[in-house]
Protein backbone atom coordinates (compact mmCIF):
# COMPACT_ATOMS: atom_id res chain seq x y z
CA UNK A 1 0.00 0.00 0.00
CA UNK A 2 1.13 3.54 -0.57
CA UNK A 3 0.91 6.71 1.50
CA UNK A 4 -0.68 9.59 -0.14
CA UNK A 5 1.09 13.28 -0.90
CA UNK A 6 0.01 16.23 -2.19
CA UNK A 7 1.45 19.75 -3.95
CA UNK A 8 0.06 22.55 -6.10
CA UNK A 9 0.27 22.73 -9.83
CA UNK A 10 3.97 24.95 -9.75
CA UNK A 11 4.86 24.11 -6.50
CA UNK A 12 7.84 21.88 -5.37
CA UNK A 13 6.09 18.26 -3.88
CA UNK A 14 8.31 16.74 -1.38
CA UNK A 15 8.82 12.97 -0.85
CA UNK A 16 9.83 11.73 2.06
CA UNK A 17 12.28 8.95 2.78
CA UNK A 18 14.93 8.36 5.57
CA UNK A 19 17.29 5.38 6.63
CA UNK A 20 19.90 5.33 9.13
CA UNK A 21 23.41 4.30 7.89
CA UNK A 22 25.09 1.87 9.97
CA UNK A 23 27.83 3.92 10.35
CA UNK A 24 28.75 7.36 9.55
CA UNK A 25 29.58 6.80 5.76
CA UNK A 26 28.49 3.48 5.10
CA UNK A 27 25.82 4.66 3.09
CA UNK A 28 24.09 1.96 1.04
CA UNK A 29 22.49 2.90 -2.72
CA UNK A 30 19.39 4.53 -2.56
CA UNK A 31 16.80 4.68 -5.91
CA UNK A 32 13.79 6.68 -6.63
CA UNK A 33 11.31 5.63 -9.56
CA UNK A 34 8.03 6.61 -11.06
CA UNK A 35 5.78 3.33 -10.32
CA UNK A 36 5.21 1.01 -7.67
CA UNK A 37 8.45 -0.48 -6.22
CA UNK A 38 9.07 -4.19 -8.78
CA UNK A 39 10.57 -6.99 -7.27
CA UNK A 40 13.82 -5.42 -7.67
CA UNK A 41 14.97 -2.15 -8.27
CA UNK A 42 13.26 0.87 -9.57
CA UNK A 43 11.34 1.09 -12.64
CA UNK A 44 11.53 4.70 -14.56
CA UNK A 45 14.68 5.55 -12.51
CA UNK A 46 14.44 9.78 -11.96
CA UNK A 47 17.35 9.60 -9.31
CA UNK A 48 19.82 7.37 -7.92
CA UNK A 49 22.57 7.10 -5.37
CA UNK A 50 25.40 4.45 -5.10
CA UNK A 51 27.58 4.35 -1.43
CA UNK A 52 29.15 7.86 -2.18
CA UNK A 53 27.30 9.74 -4.50
CA UNK A 54 24.00 11.07 -6.35
CA UNK A 55 25.21 9.35 -9.33
CA UNK A 56 21.96 9.55 -11.44
CA UNK A 57 18.94 12.13 -11.33
CA UNK A 58 16.94 13.51 -14.19
CA UNK A 59 16.51 17.54 -14.54
CA UNK A 60 13.66 18.62 -11.91
CA UNK A 61 14.25 15.62 -9.30
CA UNK A 62 16.55 16.23 -6.89
CA UNK A 63 17.95 15.60 -2.93
CA UNK A 64 16.92 18.75 -0.94
CA UNK A 65 18.01 16.87 2.57
CA UNK A 66 21.83 15.61 3.29
CA UNK A 67 21.69 11.94 2.03
CA UNK A 68 24.94 11.55 3.65
CA UNK A 69 23.28 11.40 6.83
CA UNK A 70 20.10 9.17 5.45
CA UNK A 71 17.59 11.55 4.11
CA UNK A 72 16.86 10.73 0.69
CA UNK A 73 13.84 12.33 0.50
CA UNK A 74 12.48 13.55 -3.30
CA UNK A 75 12.33 17.07 -4.13
CA UNK A 76 10.01 17.54 -7.45
CA UNK A 77 10.56 20.92 -8.69
CA UNK A 78 7.74 23.10 -10.72
CA UNK A 79 5.59 20.20 -10.52
CA UNK A 80 2.71 19.63 -13.13
CA UNK A 81 -0.35 17.77 -13.07
CA UNK A 82 1.36 14.75 -15.21
CA UNK A 83 3.90 14.08 -11.74
CA UNK A 84 0.91 12.86 -10.68
CA UNK A 85 1.10 8.93 -9.42
CA UNK A 86 3.08 6.70 -7.45
CA UNK A 87 7.16 7.00 -6.83
CA UNK A 88 9.29 4.12 -5.47
CA UNK A 89 11.83 4.99 -2.76
CA UNK A 90 14.02 1.82 -2.56
CA UNK A 91 16.89 1.74 -0.05
CA UNK A 92 18.90 -1.13 -1.43
CA UNK A 93 20.48 -2.71 1.48
CA UNK A 94 22.98 -5.51 1.06
CA UNK A 95 21.82 -9.00 0.93
CA UNK A 96 18.62 -11.45 -0.54
CA UNK A 97 15.78 -9.32 -0.25
CA UNK A 98 16.71 -6.87 2.35
CA UNK A 99 15.66 -3.79 0.50
CA UNK A 100 13.92 -1.33 2.50
CA UNK A 101 10.59 0.18 -0.41
CA UNK A 102 8.11 2.70 0.16
CA UNK A 103 5.47 2.95 -2.47
CA UNK A 104 4.58 6.86 -1.90
CA UNK A 105 1.43 8.30 -3.80
CA UNK A 106 1.62 12.23 -5.55
CA UNK A 107 -1.86 13.85 -5.73
CA UNK A 108 -1.21 17.07 -7.46
CA UNK A 109 -3.56 19.68 -7.06
CA UNK A 110 -4.52 22.71 -9.56
CA UNK A 111 -2.80 25.79 -8.94
CA UNK A 112 -5.44 28.52 -6.92
CA UNK A 113 -5.06 31.53 -9.21
CA UNK A 114 -6.82 34.71 -7.57
CA UNK A 115 -8.03 36.66 -10.83
CA UNK A 116 -6.10 39.89 -11.30
CA UNK A 117 -7.20 43.37 -13.11
CA UNK A 118 -4.41 42.80 -16.13
CA UNK A 119 -3.42 39.93 -18.43
CA UNK A 120 0.36 40.86 -16.88
CA UNK A 121 -1.09 40.62 -13.51
CA UNK A 122 -2.62 37.06 -14.75
CA UNK A 123 0.90 35.49 -15.91
CA UNK A 124 2.89 36.62 -12.71
CA UNK A 125 -0.42 35.63 -10.50
CA UNK A 126 -0.15 32.12 -12.36
CA UNK A 127 3.81 31.81 -12.00
CA UNK A 128 4.82 33.35 -8.50
CA UNK A 129 8.46 33.75 -8.28
CA UNK A 130 9.44 30.39 -6.50
CA UNK A 131 12.90 30.28 -4.79
CA UNK A 132 14.02 27.41 -2.97
CA UNK A 133 16.24 27.52 -0.25
CA UNK A 134 19.30 24.54 -0.54
CA UNK A 135 18.44 22.53 3.14
CA UNK A 136 18.96 19.17 5.03
CA UNK A 137 15.56 18.08 4.95
CA UNK A 138 11.98 18.53 3.72
CA UNK A 139 12.34 21.43 1.04
CA UNK A 140 11.14 24.70 1.96
CA UNK A 141 9.47 26.56 -0.65
CA UNK A 142 8.78 30.62 -0.66
CA UNK A 143 6.32 32.01 -2.90
CA UNK A 144 7.06 35.54 -2.90
CA UNK A 145 3.65 36.38 -4.72
CA UNK A 146 2.97 38.20 -7.85
CA UNK A 147 5.67 40.02 -9.63
CA UNK A 148 4.27 42.92 -11.55
CA UNK A 149 7.44 44.28 -13.64
CA UNK A 150 8.68 41.11 -14.27
CA UNK A 151 8.56 40.62 -17.72
CA UNK A 152 9.45 36.49 -19.61
CA UNK A 153 13.13 37.41 -20.37
CA UNK A 154 13.76 37.99 -16.59
CA UNK A 155 11.50 34.94 -15.70
CA UNK A 156 13.55 32.49 -17.69
CA UNK A 157 17.20 34.36 -16.53
CA UNK A 158 15.91 33.94 -13.02
CA UNK A 159 14.64 29.83 -13.72
CA UNK A 160 18.40 29.45 -15.41
CA UNK A 161 20.15 30.96 -12.57
CA UNK A 162 18.06 28.94 -9.94
CA UNK A 163 18.86 25.53 -11.94
CA UNK A 164 22.21 26.62 -12.16
CA UNK A 165 22.63 27.35 -8.55
CA UNK A 166 21.36 24.35 -7.71
CA UNK A 167 23.49 21.89 -9.79
CA UNK A 168 26.80 23.89 -8.82
CA UNK A 169 25.21 22.94 -5.13
CA UNK A 170 25.01 19.33 -6.14
CA UNK A 171 27.92 19.09 -7.88
CA UNK A 172 30.19 21.16 -4.82
CA UNK A 173 28.29 18.47 -2.13
CA UNK A 174 28.65 15.19 -4.13
CA UNK A 175 31.34 15.55 -6.75
CA UNK A 176 28.48 14.00 -9.05
CA UNK A 177 28.39 12.72 -12.52
CA UNK A 178 25.36 14.54 -13.96
CA UNK A 179 23.39 13.20 -16.44
CA UNK A 180 20.25 15.84 -17.07
CA UNK A 181 17.82 14.31 -19.31
CA UNK B 1 30.65 5.77 24.19
CA UNK B 2 28.75 7.92 22.57
CA UNK B 3 27.76 11.48 25.00
CA UNK B 4 26.98 14.47 24.77
CA UNK B 5 27.65 16.64 27.41
CA UNK B 6 26.42 20.17 28.29
CA UNK B 7 27.51 23.31 29.98
CA UNK B 8 26.09 24.10 33.38
CA UNK B 9 22.91 26.09 34.76
CA UNK B 10 22.94 29.52 34.00
CA UNK B 11 21.21 32.06 35.74
CA UNK B 12 20.81 35.65 33.97
CA UNK B 13 18.79 38.39 34.39
CA UNK B 14 15.90 39.32 31.53
CA UNK B 15 16.88 41.06 28.55
CA UNK B 16 20.12 39.17 28.56
CA UNK B 17 21.76 37.03 26.46
CA UNK B 18 23.31 33.39 26.97
CA UNK B 19 25.07 30.40 24.72
CA UNK B 20 24.99 27.19 25.95
CA UNK B 21 27.14 24.72 24.75
CA UNK B 22 27.04 20.77 23.92
CA UNK B 23 30.20 18.85 23.29
CA UNK B 24 30.08 15.34 21.50
CA UNK B 25 31.94 12.47 22.57
CA UNK B 26 32.89 9.22 20.29
CA UNK B 27 31.35 10.41 17.09
CA UNK B 28 31.91 13.66 14.80
CA UNK B 29 29.37 15.94 14.76
CA UNK B 30 29.41 16.86 10.77
CA UNK B 31 28.60 13.24 10.91
CA UNK B 32 24.87 14.04 12.61
CA UNK B 33 22.60 16.42 12.53
CA UNK B 34 22.11 18.39 15.85
CA UNK B 35 19.66 19.52 17.82
CA UNK B 36 18.01 21.44 20.39
CA UNK B 37 14.84 21.00 22.58
CA UNK B 38 13.08 23.10 25.19
CA UNK B 39 11.64 21.61 28.57
CA UNK B 40 9.76 24.00 31.05
CA UNK B 41 8.98 22.47 34.03
CA UNK B 42 6.17 19.85 34.27
CA UNK B 43 5.62 20.63 30.36
CA UNK B 44 6.38 18.88 27.75
CA UNK B 45 9.48 18.86 24.56
CA UNK B 46 9.43 21.68 22.30
CA UNK B 47 12.00 21.39 19.23
CA UNK B 48 14.03 25.21 18.85
CA UNK B 49 15.82 23.71 16.08
CA UNK B 50 18.84 22.14 14.73
CA UNK B 51 22.40 22.70 12.80
CA UNK B 52 23.99 20.21 10.10
CA UNK B 53 28.10 21.12 11.69
CA UNK B 54 29.22 19.83 8.40
CA UNK B 55 27.76 23.23 6.72
CA UNK B 56 26.30 24.78 9.41
CA UNK B 57 23.05 24.79 7.73
CA UNK B 58 19.93 25.46 10.15
CA UNK B 59 16.25 25.07 10.60
CA UNK B 60 14.39 26.96 13.42
CA UNK B 61 10.83 26.26 14.88
CA UNK B 62 8.89 29.13 13.52
CA UNK B 63 8.72 29.87 17.65
CA UNK B 64 12.24 30.35 17.94
CA UNK B 65 13.18 32.42 15.15
CA UNK B 66 14.91 35.47 15.83
CA UNK B 67 15.31 34.29 19.40
CA UNK B 68 17.56 31.52 19.30
CA UNK B 69 20.59 31.02 17.04
CA UNK B 70 22.66 27.37 16.68
CA UNK B 71 25.81 27.44 15.73
CA UNK B 72 28.48 24.47 15.94
CA UNK B 73 32.26 24.35 15.75
CA UNK B 74 33.80 21.29 14.05
CA UNK B 75 37.08 21.88 15.84
CA UNK B 76 35.52 21.36 19.26
CA UNK B 77 33.02 18.85 18.08
CA UNK B 78 30.58 21.26 20.13
CA UNK B 79 27.36 22.78 19.10
CA UNK B 80 26.34 26.12 20.76
CA UNK B 81 22.67 27.67 21.49
CA UNK B 82 22.33 31.21 21.93
CA UNK B 83 19.22 32.69 23.27
CA UNK B 84 18.65 36.71 23.01
CA UNK B 85 16.77 39.32 24.58
CA UNK B 86 15.64 36.76 27.69
CA UNK B 87 12.64 36.75 29.52
CA UNK B 88 10.73 34.49 31.97
CA UNK B 89 9.10 32.30 29.18
CA UNK B 90 12.56 31.22 28.80
CA UNK B 91 13.29 29.51 32.00
CA UNK B 92 13.53 25.56 31.37
CA UNK B 93 16.01 22.72 30.62
CA UNK B 94 17.54 23.22 27.25
CA UNK B 95 18.34 19.50 25.76
CA UNK B 96 20.57 19.05 22.93
CA UNK B 97 20.44 15.64 20.96
CA UNK B 98 21.49 13.89 17.72
CA UNK B 99 18.92 12.93 15.21
CA UNK B 100 19.95 9.76 12.80
CA UNK B 101 18.42 11.27 10.98
CA UNK B 102 14.62 12.07 11.63
CA UNK B 103 14.70 10.56 15.63
CA UNK B 104 16.74 11.67 18.73
CA UNK B 105 19.00 8.99 19.69
CA UNK B 106 21.00 10.60 22.01
CA UNK B 107 20.35 13.22 24.71
CA UNK B 108 22.97 15.39 26.57
CA UNK B 109 21.63 15.93 29.96
CA UNK B 110 20.18 19.17 29.90
CA UNK B 111 21.28 22.95 30.99
CA UNK B 112 18.67 24.28 32.97
CA UNK B 113 18.91 28.01 32.29
CA UNK B 114 16.93 30.60 34.63
CA UNK B 115 16.09 33.61 34.12
CA UNK B 116 15.37 35.91 36.90
CA UNK B 117 16.41 39.49 38.29
CA UNK C 1 3.24 22.83 11.26
CA UNK C 2 2.34 18.90 11.68
CA UNK C 3 0.15 19.00 14.97
CA UNK C 4 0.85 16.12 17.30
CA UNK C 5 -2.38 14.94 19.54
CA UNK C 6 -1.27 12.63 21.50
CA UNK C 7 -3.52 10.49 24.14
CA UNK C 8 -4.42 9.79 26.68
CA UNK C 9 -2.77 13.14 28.89
CA UNK C 10 -2.39 10.51 31.95
CA UNK C 11 -3.63 6.98 32.65
CA UNK C 12 -3.31 5.12 35.84
CA UNK C 13 -3.09 1.31 35.56
CA UNK C 14 -2.09 -1.65 37.61
CA UNK C 15 1.35 -3.87 37.27
CA UNK C 16 0.96 -6.56 34.74
CA UNK C 17 -1.66 -4.51 32.80
CA UNK C 18 -1.18 -3.84 29.08
CA UNK C 19 -1.92 -0.23 28.05
CA UNK C 20 -1.65 1.90 24.52
CA UNK C 21 -1.29 5.27 24.23
CA UNK C 22 -2.33 6.47 20.78
CA UNK C 23 -0.49 9.31 19.08
CA UNK C 24 -2.99 11.23 16.07
CA UNK C 25 -0.99 13.11 13.22
CA UNK C 26 -2.54 16.29 11.58
CA UNK C 27 -1.10 14.80 8.18
CA UNK C 28 0.74 11.76 6.71
CA UNK C 29 3.54 11.09 7.71
CA UNK C 30 4.37 7.93 6.50
CA UNK C 31 5.98 6.13 9.31
CA UNK C 32 8.49 8.53 10.06
CA UNK C 33 7.13 8.68 14.03
CA UNK C 34 9.24 7.90 16.76
CA UNK C 35 8.20 7.43 20.30
CA UNK C 36 10.52 8.37 23.39
CA UNK C 37 10.11 7.60 27.49
CA UNK C 38 11.59 10.64 30.09
CA UNK C 39 11.48 9.04 34.13
CA UNK C 40 10.66 12.29 36.67
CA UNK C 41 14.32 14.17 36.66
CA UNK C 42 15.50 12.34 33.75
CA UNK C 43 16.33 12.64 30.27
CA UNK C 44 14.18 11.37 27.22
CA UNK C 45 14.82 8.38 25.96
CA UNK C 46 14.43 7.16 22.45
CA UNK C 47 11.89 4.10 22.44
CA UNK C 48 10.92 3.33 19.28
CA UNK C 49 11.70 4.63 15.56
CA UNK C 50 9.85 4.40 12.54
CA UNK C 51 6.57 3.43 13.85
CA UNK C 52 7.43 0.26 15.12
CA UNK C 53 11.45 -0.55 15.60
CA UNK C 54 12.42 -1.20 18.90
CA UNK C 55 15.97 0.85 19.56
CA UNK C 56 18.78 -1.17 20.76
CA UNK C 57 18.84 -1.94 24.42
CA UNK C 58 14.72 -1.32 25.10
CA UNK C 59 12.90 -4.50 26.17
CA UNK C 60 10.35 -6.03 23.99
CA UNK C 61 7.44 -5.16 25.96
CA UNK C 62 7.65 -2.05 24.02
CA UNK C 63 6.09 -2.28 20.69
CA UNK C 64 5.06 0.47 18.26
CA UNK C 65 1.93 0.25 15.34
CA UNK C 66 0.47 2.68 12.51
CA UNK C 67 1.50 4.59 9.60
CA UNK C 68 -0.10 7.36 7.87
CA UNK C 69 -1.62 9.60 10.90
CA UNK C 70 -2.17 6.97 13.69
CA UNK C 71 0.15 5.58 16.17
CA UNK C 72 -0.32 3.61 19.08
CA UNK C 73 2.78 2.55 21.57
CA UNK C 74 2.04 -0.68 23.79
CA UNK C 75 3.06 -1.63 26.93
CA UNK C 76 2.76 -5.37 27.87
CA UNK C 77 3.23 -6.41 31.60
CA UNK C 78 3.85 -3.00 33.20
CA UNK C 79 6.71 -2.83 34.92
CA UNK C 80 7.32 -0.35 38.39
CA UNK C 81 9.91 1.34 35.91
CA UNK C 82 7.86 2.01 33.41
CA UNK C 83 6.46 5.27 35.14
CA UNK C 84 7.41 7.78 33.18
CA UNK C 85 6.14 10.52 30.69
CA UNK C 86 5.81 9.06 27.07
CA UNK C 87 5.99 11.31 24.04
CA UNK C 88 5.65 10.83 20.04
CA UNK C 89 7.44 13.22 18.13
CA UNK C 90 7.56 13.26 13.91
CA UNK C 91 10.49 13.58 12.38
CA UNK C 92 9.25 13.77 8.57
CA UNK C 93 8.83 17.60 8.36
CA UNK C 94 10.41 20.85 10.04
CA UNK C 95 9.66 21.79 12.20
CA UNK C 96 9.62 18.62 14.19
CA UNK C 97 6.61 18.35 16.76
CA UNK C 98 6.14 16.11 20.05
CA UNK C 99 3.01 14.70 21.38
CA UNK C 100 1.74 16.80 24.89
CA UNK C 101 3.10 13.59 26.72
CA UNK C 102 1.04 10.68 28.58
CA UNK C 103 1.99 10.58 32.22
CA UNK C 104 1.79 6.90 33.33
CA UNK C 105 1.34 6.14 36.87
CA UNK C 106 1.19 2.75 38.89
CA UNK C 107 -2.25 2.16 40.61
Known amino acids: SEVEYRAEVGQNAYLPCFYTPAAPGNLVPVCWGKGACPVFECGNVVLRTDERDVNYWTSRYWLNGDFRKGDVSLTIENVTLADSGIYCCRIQIPGIMNDEKFNLKLVIKPAKVTPAPTRQRDFTAAFPRMLTTRGHGPAETQTLGSLPDINLTQISTLANELRDSRLANDLRDSGATIRIG | EVQLQQSGAELVKPGASVKLSCTASDFNIKDYYLHWVKQRTEQGLEWIGRIDPDDGETKYGPKFQGKATITADTSSNTAFLQLSSLTSEDTAVYFCSRSNPYYFDYWGQGTTLTVSS | DIQMNQSPSSLSASLGDTITITCHVS??????LSWYQQKPGNIPKLLIYKASNLHTGVTSRFSGSGAGTGFTLTISSLQPEDIATYYCQQGQNYPYTFGGGTKLEIK
Open chain 3, 27 to 32: QNINVW
